[in-house]
Amino acid sequence: SERCDDWGLDTMRQIQVFEDEPARIKCPLFEHFLKYNYSTAHSSGLTLIWYWTRQDRDLEEPINFRLPENRISKEKDVLWFRPTLLNDTGNYTCMLRNTTYCSKVAFPLEVVQKDSCFNSAMRFPVHKMYIEHGIHKITCPNVDGYFPSSVKPSVTWYKGCTEIVDFHNVLPEGMNLSFFIPLVSNNGNYTCVVTYPENGRLFHLTRTVTVKVVGSPKDALPPQIYSPNDRVVYEKEPGEELVIPCKVYFSFIMDSHNEVWWTIDGKKPDDVTVDITINESVSYSSTEDETRTQILSIKKVTPEDLRRNYVCHARNTKGEAEQAAKVKQKGNGCTEPMTL
């Protein structure tokens, strides 16, 4: 047979679906690998073929489209499960071909079990919303294409295991869930259960979104250096260990890159001959403000080291800050008597 352009296993698309729920999976060829869509391919005489490899097996086999109630079917470039079963887990391949052309890609499909509180191994999308912001809406995700617009499904929203009824600042509005002046206590997993009829059967779609309330843009600031500061003097004798923490507070800024670094006499630590160790740690507040600490240490400090200029620098998308550490050599402890 002719050579086939094999795009391999597309692990970027780790598709997870819940057991005993409908699932519609589009062939990734048309979304990520080929320049044309299914309609163009089909009208050009190309055929889309599906097959799969069961979990823990090596053998590729055709998908059985003759199951009772058409449990698995194909419609254009979509593979349908109505509904899924646990043993549908495996690697699925869609192949587009005719007598002269062939292109295929495989992708993993995992059918996941959930408990009555929607706990599962499913990875949930995270929706970040700004604290105290007026209104945030989240929409029940990935339900498009499951039922026609003429069908009005019922939607029930849950926070964790609790149905959202009379929550003071969270209001279910069909497919949307509105948050009014959100607080950190609104953090959590929010689940919509969409129920719709099809051919005399009721199907359920379960979708969960993790809500994380984060600092507001109105509170965003340039980095604030807590340490070093003008109040603390690092007074050492030669031979002692010098330890200077650079502690910087970064308010949450969406997609900001927060940086902290030291310079010694204007140079990066890697560019000086001093034997310096730098250790970094990061902690986060409830609203994802970040405190980043870089500890500069010199095991056995020399008189020259104590004359150097140690500066902590910090940067985020709002600006930059720098602060020099006050380092000096300890006196010998003698004090001359004052003569009048």
Partner: antibody
Framework: EVQLLESGGGLVQPGGSLRLSCAAS????????AGWVRQAPGKGLEWVSA????????LYADSVKGRFTISRDNSKNTLYLQMNSLRAEDTAVYYC???????????WGQGTLVTVSS | EIVMTQSPATLSVSPGERATLSCRAS??????LAWYQQKPGQAPRLLIY???TRATGIPARFSGSGSGTEFTLTISSLQSEDFAVYYC?????????FGQGTKVEIK
């Protein structure tokens, strides 16, 4: 210096309406969420309503929901509380206060007395 | 809604003595608890936020502690100007709720 100055209180009959205002100065009003807290004579404090800094989000205590409306005009640095269908139990000193999630109600006005009586 | 319960309702203390006020939440409010002082005819004044952080200009004799459901406001050595009503308030969940208040009076 931060200042919040309420006005608009007074005597009103049951079923009547009143509009309270709160003029803010000394801080960036448009960056501050705000709210109203009331205190019935000889009683404790009761949160009434809140509004987000952008004016889009509003919340109300169950006791006033559907009757009171909070709003703000950031260009005038002013917070409002429109009170309709007033009842005798709405009689109280009404305080406007700035709030932040991190510090709660950190600045308060001096209060304005609303008396609902026939 | 979260119910805040303060105890005692009234606390009689001599000037210079220590006063300890308690506040209990019906469910966890994390550290999102504030304490206010109110004197007759005046607006409340923020003393403590975040359960233990003193607000700007508040003397060091006022301290707050606790997290979750149990909180304490301590006034280490009562001054004459400290005799007032003290309210706790949770701002973890909407609706924000206040305790019924503790009156600190001169013994």
């Amino acid at each position: 210096e931060v200042q919040l100055l309420e006005s608009g209180g007074g005597l009103v009959q049951p079923g009547g309406s009143l509009r309270l205002s709160c003029a803010a100065s000394g801080f960036t009003f448009e960056h501050s969420s705000a709210g109203w807290v009331r205190q019935a004579p000889g009683k404790g404090l009761e949160w009434v309503s809140a509004i987000s800094y952008d004016g889009e989000g509003t919340l109300y205590a169950d006791s006033v929901k559907g009757r009171f409306t909070i709003s703000r005009d950031n260009s005038k640095n002013t917070l409002y509380l429109q009170m309709n269908s007033l009842r005798a139990e709405d009689t109280a000193v009404y305080y406007c206060a700035r709030f932040r999630y991190y510090t709660a109600f950190d600045y308060w006005g001096q209060g304005t007395l609303v008396t609902v009586s026939s | 809604e979260i119910v805040m319960t303060q105890s005692p309702a009234t606390l009689s203390v001599s000037p210079g003595e220590r006063a300890t006020l308690s506040c209990r939440a019906s469910q966890s409010v994390s550290s999102n608890l504030a304490w206010y002082q109110q004197k007759p005819g005046q607006a409340p004044r923020l003393l403590i936020y975040g359960a233990s952080t003193r607000a700007t200009g508040i003397p060091a004799r006022f301290s707050g502690s606790g997290s979750g459901t149990e909180f304490t406001l301590t006034i280490s050595s009562l001054q004459s100007e400290d005799f007032a009503v003290y309210y706790c308030q949770q701002y973890n969940n909407w609706p924000w709720t206040f305790g019924q208040g503790t009156k600190v009076e001169i013994k």
